[in-house]
Amino acid sequence: MMTGTIETTGNISAEKGGSIILQCHLSSTTAQVTQVNWEQQDQLLAICNADLGWHISPSFKDRVAPGPGLGLTLQSLTVNDTGEYFCIYHTYPDGTYTGRIFLEVLESSVAEHGARFQIP
């Protein structure tokens, strides 16, 4: 039985050209996290494997940085980065947990800076 829950930063916004941290947290389970995948719609951004460490997909190497923790830092944001992001936790013995974050990249300084994981 899967008892865990994923907490995410939810809906967040950031300015074009800036950076943002996508963060998920798995709680309420003793399952071992073996791998976390970060995906944007159907594109794999990065993998954090418990044994192999981080692997950033080649097409995102220039703009994606691993961490902090199991989170992911997106840099040099463009309006095209607006959309859904998913953290997919592969765990043993529970299975897979998925969290969703919606990022809106805004053209001007109307972006909200209240998200607690955002980089100033």
Partner: antibody, heavy 117, light 107 residues
Framework: EVQLLESGGGLVQPGGSLRLSCAAS????????MTWVRQAPGKGLEWVSA????????YYADSVKGRFTISRDNSKNTLYLQMNSLRAEDTAVYYC??????????WGQGTLVTVSS | DIQMTQSPSSLSASVGDRVTITCSGD??????TSWYQQKPGKAPKLLIY???TLASGVPSRFSGSGSGTDFTLTISSLQPEDFATYYC?????????FGQGTKVEIK
């Protein structure tokens, strides 16, 4: 006792192919990712490729991407490295190693690959 | 890619000396650094992992420290069997990278 035994090295001409094997024993093979690391004569260590325990994901250094293929047969407790389009700069001792939590805890004795005409 | 800069590239020391080897890496900010010992004609052997954890069977005269971008391997009292080449390695992100090695020679 964990043991890793590489084989398949030898002399090959530039552009040629070679398949290295690494026979593993003394541990539950499919529970561990595995990796290949090479060392050119008189030089330092260079990571080549890694594979997850299931074999479902593989990773490569840019220097070998598209030419080398890592694979494993968990029923035979064996790791492989298929090397194609070999170049002089691929000349090295190739080591297989077991991966555990971001480090390489057991290494084989190595097998020498020489690429020369 | 994360570059691991190891220093010194070589050093001469006597039995009983305290030896320190350092490794620094850009963009690290973690403790996923390991140290290996290699003797001529032999495979590398794991000494330290996660920056400071001693691998099984490794003598307690070896120790590791550091976090973030700078890591250190210390041999508290050099023994004859410790003359070898030592490598650091980062396992935080692929491609894994090694330092260029430090050769510890007899003075």
């Amino acid at each position: 006792e964990v043991q890793l035994l590489e084989s398949g090295g030898g002399l090959v001409q530039p552009g040629g192919s070679l398949r290295l094997s690494c026979a593993a024993s003394g541990f539950t093979f499919n529970a561990y990712p595995m990796t290949w690391v090479r060392q050119a004569p008189g030089k330092g260590l260079e990571w080549v490729s890694a594979i997850t325990g299931s074999g479902g994901s593989t990773y490569y250094a840019d220097s070998v991407k598209g030419r080398f293929t890592i694979s494993r047969d968990n029923s035979k407790n064996t790791l492989y490295l298929q090397m194609n389009s070999l170049r002089a700069e691929d000349t090295a001792v190739y080591y297989c190693a077991r991966v555990w939590r971001n480090h390489l805890d057991y290494w084989g004795q190595g097998t020498l690959v020489t690429v020369s005409s | 890619d994360i570059q691991m800069t190891q220093s010194p590239s070589s050093l001469s020391a006597s039995v009983g000396d305290r030896v320190t080897i350092t490794c620094s890496g850009d963009k690290l900010g973690h403790t996923y650094t390991s140290w290996y010992q290699q003797k001529p004609g032999k495979a590398p052997k794991l000494l330290i992992y996660r920056a400071s954890t001693l691998a099984s069977g490794v003598p307690s005269r070896f120790s590791g420290s550091g976090s973030g971008t700078d890591f250190t391997l210390t041999i508290s009292s050099l023994q004859p069997e410790d003359f070898a080449t030592y490598y650091c390695q980062q396992g935080y992100t692929l491609p894994w990278t090694f330092g260029q090695g430090t050769k510890v020679e007899i003075k």
